[in-house]
């Protein structure tokens, strides 16, 4: 079971990223799928080690105080959410914005029906060219 | 099916980065290999995680406008060079560089034959330092 | 055999990242234990994909002029340490500090015994918040 | 759902050029590659060559320079020229989609019969 | 090219019987190796590849192994819709070839 998206820019104003099955994208079975574009979601317990890329463009002027903040998130069947993992990059100072990468990767016991989504502070810093953003997951 | 090479400095002018055999190394058995120093090369068709890591050292002030960008990219026996990853990290300002670390990894499907290799902007600023910039795969 | 163990703050002195089985952690069994909260020690024999994040909290005037620096590194029985990976970060000019995020991930073999475990140059800058940094492993 | 259509002539004369066209539906030719495979009666399967779904190509160097495969992504159709034909290449002509990203065929046509006499 | 030798070239078996195809390669081929079925006037389908992955919609009476040089495809409980020639074919470099056909019929 082993899942990789591709991210895909959006028109909604929500934090959570939308992604796409999409250029060199793997989607191995139906064990695990992408749902609504926006989060993938397993149908077999176990153990699975999940990673997401997000590359952001973004300016310390034209952005608030606070970091970019990327959080890879789990929602469970009738559990509330919770974060799993998260990264943090101050700004950068160059203009009209400074590039820079996130990698979060971590081994995470999911139930059946468990989903992941990742969560970003401002979505319409994300980078969506070929390659710099994605997600994914695989079972041991 | 596993491999993790080390980074190699290089008198060669090309944006592929060069690896190793070396240090603590792993190349499980000959079902990957390490060619021409350059990619990695799987003889067996599936699903890979493949990462690699890259730190480097630059100046705003001595470098292009244009971010340092690493790519994951493949070649598939016949077929077309193409991205699989990017990340990119804006030149910092420190003298007489600043030091930053990028780190790439996802599940591709691979086919016989398939290399996989690394490129960056400007390979004179990668670190080759012990355990700084290093490339690997396992299958699942 | 899996694990992923979350940071934890220390009082102690020492450069090397404390750890815990503390809010959405994984200890697969017992062939992989964390000893004393700082290492990782597998029982068994084999090929390991070993990550860690640290996310840090830095300013360029406060800190020594020298890159915040994570490393990961192993000690088998009988061996000396050695560095499996490392990562640098320049620190921001961001006030009172700014957040950056690392992240390391890679293959080894380990012997029975041997346990990895996470140097930081300066702990004090760790960031121990939600899913901000943590360290893990799996047998492939 | 998934479907391969074959199509063309069912004579050729000893010499001249052979086209065939193969319909797909159920699938983009973007994202799967397609496979001529060809089998004489009563005899095996033999791989003719690949149309790539990033638009390149690759052919079965035993067949010599013959076979030129071409695409219509407009019109979800890949095309196989072959020429020269002699009657030993008098066959069955099978397109056939690769699977995702994988080298192996899931799904087939019909198949076109040809006869070169 | 790499040449591909099956064996048998026809067998027959009685229904609910277990069969096994054999098929020698003349290099390694790193488990790169697929098993079709062609039933009597029909195009091949895709039952094995990776030498012991099983094709969707495959059923699990068939199954697949080997390594090196050589592979067998296991037909379980055999069913009438069995009745069919098999192929196996190698996708370790290029050009891709198929083993000559092994044709199975019931007793």
């Known amino acids: 079971i082993a899942a990789h998206v591709i991210s895909e820019a959006s028109s909604k104003t929500t934090s959570v990223l939308q992604w796409a099955e999409k250029g060199y994208y793997t989607m191995s079975n139906n064990l695990v799928t992408l749902e609504n574009g926006k989060q993938l979601t397993v149908k077999r317990q176990g153990l699975y080690y999940i990673y997401a890329q997000v590359t952001f463009c973004s300016n310390r002027e034209a952005s608030s105080q606070a970091p970019f903040i990327a959080s890879l998130c789990l929602k469970s069947p009738g559990r509330f959410e919770r974060i799993l993992l998260r990264a943090a990059n101050t700004h950068s100072s160059a203009k009209p914005c400074g590039q820079q990468s996130i990698h979060l990767g971590g081994v995470f016991e999911l139930q059946p029906g468990a989903s992941v989504f990742v969560n970003v502070t401002d979505p319409s810093q994300v980078s969506h060219g070929t390659g710099f953003t994605s997600f994914g997951l695989l079972k041991l | 099916i596993a491999a993790h090479v080390i980074s190699e400095a290089s008198s060669k002018t090309t944006s592929v980065l060069q690896w190793a055999e070396k240090g603590y190394y792993t190349m499980s058995n000959n079902l990957v290999t390490l060619e021409n120093g350059k990619q990695l090369t799987v003889k067996r068709q599936g699903l890979y995680y493949i990462y690699a890591q890259v730190t480097f050292c630059s100046n705003r002030e001595a470098s292009s406008q244009a971010p340092f960008i690493a790519s994951l990219c493949l070649k598939s026996p016949g077929r077309f060079e193409r991205i699989l990853l990017r990340a990119a990290n804006t030149h910092s300002s420190a003298k007489p560089c600043g030091q930053q670390s990028i780190h790439l990894g996802g599940v591709f499907e691979l086919q016989p034959g398939a290399s996989v290799f690394v490129n960056v902007t400007d390979p004179s600023q990668v670190s080759h330092g012990t355990g700084f910039t290093s490339f690997g795969l396992l299958k699942l | 055999i899996a694990a992923h163990v979350i940071s934890e703050a220390s009082s102690k002195t020492t450069s090397v990242l404390q750890w815990a089985e503390k809010g959405y952690y994984t200890m697969s069994n017992n062939l992989v234990t964390l000893e004393n909260g700082k290492q990782l020690t597998v029982k068994r024999q084999g090929l390991y994909y070993i990550y860690a994040q640290v996310t840090f909290c830095s300013n360029r005037e406060a800190s020594s002029q020298a890159p915040f620096i994570a490393s990961l590194c192993l000690k088998s029985p009988g061996r000396f340490e050695r560095i499996l990976l490392r990562a640098a970060n320049t620190h921001s000019s961001a006030k009172p500090c700014g957040q950056q995020s690392i992240h390391l991930g890679g293959v080894f073999e380990l012997q029975p015994g041997a346990s990895v475990f996470v140097n930081v140059t300066d702990p004090s800058q760790v960031s121990h918040g939600t899913g901000f940094t943590s360290f893990g492993l799996l047998k492939l | 759902q998934v479907q391969l259509t074959e199509s063309g002539p069912g004579l050729v004369q000893p010499s001249q050029t052979l086209s065939l066209t193969c319909t797909v539906s159920?699938?983009?030719?973007?994202?799967?590659?397609i496979s001529w495979v060809r089998q004489p009666p009563g005899k095996g399967l033999e791989w003719v060559g690949v149309?790539?779904?990033?638009?390149?190509?690759l052919y079965n160097s035993a067949l010599k320079s013959r076979p030129s495969i071409s695409r219509d992504t407009s019109k979800s159709q890949v095309f196989l020229k072959m020429s020269s034909l002699q009657t030993e290449d008098t066959a069955t002509y099978y397109c056939?989609?690769?699977?995702?990203?994988?080298?192996?065929?899931?799904?087939w046509g019909q198949g076109a019969s040809v006869t070169v006499s | 090219d790499i040449q591909m030798t099956q064996s048998p070239a026809s067998l027959s078996a009685s229904l609910g019987e277990t069969v096994t195809i054999e098929c020698r390669t003349s290099e390694d081929i790193y488990s790169n190796l697929a098993w079709y079925r062609q039933r009597p006037g029909k195009s091949p389908q895709l039952l094995i590849y990776?030498?012991?992955r099983l094709a969707d919609g495959v059923p699990s009476r068939f199954s697949g192994s080997g390594s090196g040089t050589q592979y067998s495809l296991k037909i379980n409980s055999l069913q009438s819709e069995d009745v069919a020639s098999y192929f196996c074919?190698?996708?370790?470099?290029?050009?891709?070839t198929f083993g000559g056909d092994t044709k199975l019929e019931l007793k």
């Open positions: 990776d030498t012991n």
């Open positions: 149309m790539w779904n990033d638009g390149g190509t």
């Open positions: 074919q190698h996708y370790s470099n290029f050009p891709w």
């Open positions: 159920g699938f983009s030719l973007t994202s799967h590659h």
């Open positions: 056939a989609r690769g699977k995702m990203h994988y080298y192996v065929l899931d799904a």
